[in-house]
């Protein structure tokens, strides 16, 4: 008769590598007498004999996992006990190996230039896959803007136009490689004006073409605004090339105006807009205004309310579709420009502009606007606003229109009637009369070039002393 023998595990468990959905087997060979009872644990939890995912054979010495799942990894132990001596145990690890799998692939993205884009790429696999990205046909290089995150996602800071293209992520480990489908990164760019329309000073009745070019993704649309309203006349020609839209507005000029080019494109539900403006002024505007039709009425606007004589009738030019509104917009635009000029110049320029745009009016059979007297215009130009006027004229000669007074509908002083010839034919500016009496701080540089044609005028220098010869009364 055999002697009782305590169990001995003759083939200890080893680490088993297994692929998902494949079979994994642990062998636990035991010598003992009587025959031992063998049980199995996974991570110290007993594996039940009736669990259909497992097969236990050879008197319990063979444990087979029939279809490995990634959750099966862990420490497996066999415990043998036959009542002789103590129970014995041997343990081994199951490492579930897995080919790379992309669980959250990237998707198509539209992003606005300058923002941050993140293309997801979440993966599974054992060993843990390394993730790289391909743009077009080339491996994507990381830099200060472009990084592959720990999660596998691709992060692009400060997205640029050149980042647009087709991307795919690649997950790789020792068992294989997985590719995502190609996705498209579209970079949208806010509308931006590349070439603003230029201001023009033209003769009445001439043709002018205003040109505005804009860029953006999607390609912007361009609309034109005239004195705040949609352009009522003129023809527009447009062309698009390489995401640049070129719009040309051809106008027949019968009145001065502020023309605004508005470039707009859409980003999802939102729009981006860029604007640029140009003025079209008419040489000898007073003359063309005088020749045009109009009516006399009280001024109802806001801008010139404090400047114009109370309850005076002013001239409204009916060559505008809405004279009140158009003239008010012109003066409002001028007013904003005047924020840049000196405190000495500003009130004088305001008085000049208001009385020029809203000329005093004689209501007769033919309503007649009364222009400003030449002497007052010159006082503003050569005394109160000498510095600004000089700067403006200098910039005009060089083709630069940037500061202070360039947008202003200023009269050409030399073309205005002199009050010395006919005091009833022109309008005085009471503000200047008042200021003349109160000026004590002007620079004492007197004119070196007297005006031959008009008496009692300062000559065209940049600053003046008020002398008795300079008479506006």
């Amino acid at each position: 008769e055999k002697l009782p023998k305590a169990p001995v595990i003759t083939t200890p468990l080893e680490t088993v590598d297994a692929l998902v959905e494949e079979v994994a087997t642990f062998m636990c060979a035991v010598e003992s007498y009587p025959q031992p009872e063998i049980s199995w644990t996974r991570n110290k939890i007993l594996i039940k004999l009736f669990d259909t995912r497992y097969s236990i054979r050879e008197n319990g010495q063979l444990l087979t996992i029939l279809s490995v799942e990634d959750s099966d990894d862990g420490i497996y132990c066999c415990i043998a006990n036959n009542g002789v001596g103590g129970a014995v145990e041997s343990c081994g690890a199951l490492q579930v190996k897995m080919k790379p799998k992309i669980t959250r692939p990237p998707i198509n993205v539209k992003i606005i230039e300058g923002l941050k884009a993140v293309l997801p790429c979440t993966t599974m696999g054992n060993p843990k896959p390394s993730v790289s990205w391909i743009k077009g046909d080339n491996a994507l290089r990381e830099n200060s803007r472009i990084a592959v995150l720990e999660s596998g996602s691709l992060r692009i800071h400060n997205v640029q136009k050149e980042d647009a293209g087709q991307y795919r992520c690649v997950a790789k480990n020792s068992l294989g490689t997985a590719y995502s489908k190609l996705v498209k990164l579209e970079v949208e760019v806010f509308a931006r004006i590349l070439r603003a329309p230029e201001s023009h000073n033209v003769t009445f009745g001439s043709f002018v073409t205003l040109r505005c070019t804009a860029i953006g993704i999607p390609v912007p649309t361009i609309s034109w605004i005239e004195n705040g309203n949609a352009v009522s006349s003129g023809s527009i020609q447009e062309s698009v090339k390489d995401r640049v839209i070129d719009s040309r507005l051809q106008l027949f000029i019968t009145k001065p105006g502020l023309y605004t080019c508005i470039a707009t494109n859409k980003h999802g539900e939102k729009f981006s807009t860029a604007k640029a403006a140009a003025t079209v002024s008419i040489a000898e505007w007073s003359k063309s205004q005088k020749d045009s039709q109009g009516y006399c009425a009280q001024y109802r606007g806001e801008v010139c309310d404090a400047v114009l004589a109370k309850d005076a009738l002013v001239f409204f030019n009916t060559s505008y579709r809405d004279p009140e509104d158009a003239q008010e917009l012109l003066i409002h635009t001028a007013w904003n420009e005047l924020k840049a000029v000196s405190p000495l110049c500003r009130p004088a320029a305001e008085a000049l502009l208001c009385n020029h745009l809203f000329q005093e009016c004689s209501p007769g059979v033919v309503p007649t606007p009364m222009p400003i007297c030449r002497e007052y215009c010159l006082a503003v130009k050569e005394l109160f606003c000498a510095k600004e006027w000089q700067a403006m004229e200098g910039k005009a000669h060089r083709g630069l229109y940037r500061s202070g007074m360039h947008l202003l509908p200023v009269p050409e002083c030399s073309k205005l009637p002199s009050m010395h010839r006919d005091p009833t034919a022109c309008t005085r500016l009471p503000y200047l009369d008042y200021k003349k009496e109160n000026i004590t701080t002007f620079p004492s540089i007197t004119s070196s070039r007297p005006s031959a044609d008009i008496p009692n005028l300062p000559a065209s220098t940049s600053s003046f002393a008020v002398s008795p010869a300079y008479s506006m009364t």
């Epitope: 009425a297 009280q298 806001e302 309850d311 809405d322 009140e324 008010e328 409002h332």
Partner: antibody, heavy 121, light 112 residues
Framework: ELQLVESGGGLVQPGGSLRLSCAAS????????MSWVRQAPGKGLEWVSA????????YYKESVKGRFTISRDNAKKTLYLQMNSLKSEDTAVYYC??????????????WGQGTLVTVSS | QAVVTQEPSLSVSPGGTVTLTCGLS?????????PDWYQQTPGQAPRALIY???SRLSGVPSRFSGSFSGNKAALTITGAQPEDEADYYC????????????FGGGTKLTVL
């Protein structure tokens, strides 16, 4: 479609306050002057207040000066009328109306449906 | 404060012509008052017809016209239609001193 929708009306005791709002849509709000006009039950129209496109000035009927304040929020496309020290004679339907151009005064070419203000104890 | 005056009521036959006037209790109505005309039917908000004396708003039938008649502003309906039965208000801009926009008392027009 151009729309002006008034709100904020209701029953208030004499001496009380109300704030009317007028939400504008379907046009470029900040290009136009706006007005409030009221109509007492069974009576004619009465201009109350006006404001130009940029809110630079405000104008009022003499009897409401110092009690009513007109204002606008161009970003929100909304016109307001703050009414304080209300009197029984302020009872009316209050209409918000759009001016045909930028300045405060002129033809009112679009009107809301009105909101009723009742001042009563 | 000047009062804006209108006929309290007028009537016209369908197809007929009627003139509504708008005056001032003291003085004349001029282009500086920028006369505007409005139509209001029962239960509805007013509707602008004519602005600044004689300019018709878009969508307003050509049978409505504005003018001056003596020292008053006038609204003429030529070829009146049944749907023209309404209250008509004129409004004047008052620029002297503090600015105001003043409505007349309204004219009740009946199309018989």
């Amino acid at each position: 479609e151009l729309q002006l929708v008034e709100s904020g009306g209701g029953l208030v005791q004499p001496g009380g306050s109300l704030r009317l709002s007028c939400a504008a849509s379907g046009f470029t709000f900040d290009d136009y002057g706006m007005s409030w006009v009221r109509q007492a039950p069974g009576k004619g129209l009465e201009w109350v207040s006006a404001i130009p496109w940029n809110g630079g000035s405000t104008y009022y009927k003499e009897s409401v000066k110092g009690r009513f304040t007109i204002s606008r929020d161009n970003a929100k496309k909304t016109l307001y009328l703050q009414m304080n020290s209300l009197k029984s004679e302020d009872t009316a339907v209050y209409y918000c109306a759009k001016r045909s151009g930028r300045i405060a005064f002129g033809a009112l070419d679009a009107w809301g449906q009105g909101t009723l203000v009742t001042v009563s104890s | 404060q000047a009062v804006v005056t209108q006929e309290p009521s007028l009537s016209v036959s369908p197809g007929g012509t009627v003139t509504l006037t708008c005056g001032l209790s003291s003085g004349s109505v001029t282009s500086s008052n920028y006369p505007d005309w409005y139509q209001q039917t029962p239960g509805q908000a007013p509707r602008a017809l004519i602005y600044s004396t004689n300019s018709r708003l878009s969508g307003v039938p050509s049978r409505f016209s504005g003018s001056f008649s003596g020292n008053k502003a006038a609204l003429t309906i030529t070829g009146a239609q049944p749907e023209d039965e309404a209250d008509y208000y004129c409004a004047l801009y008052m620029g002297s001193g503090s600015r105001n926009y003043v409505f007349g008392g309204g004219t009740k027009l009946t199309v018989l």
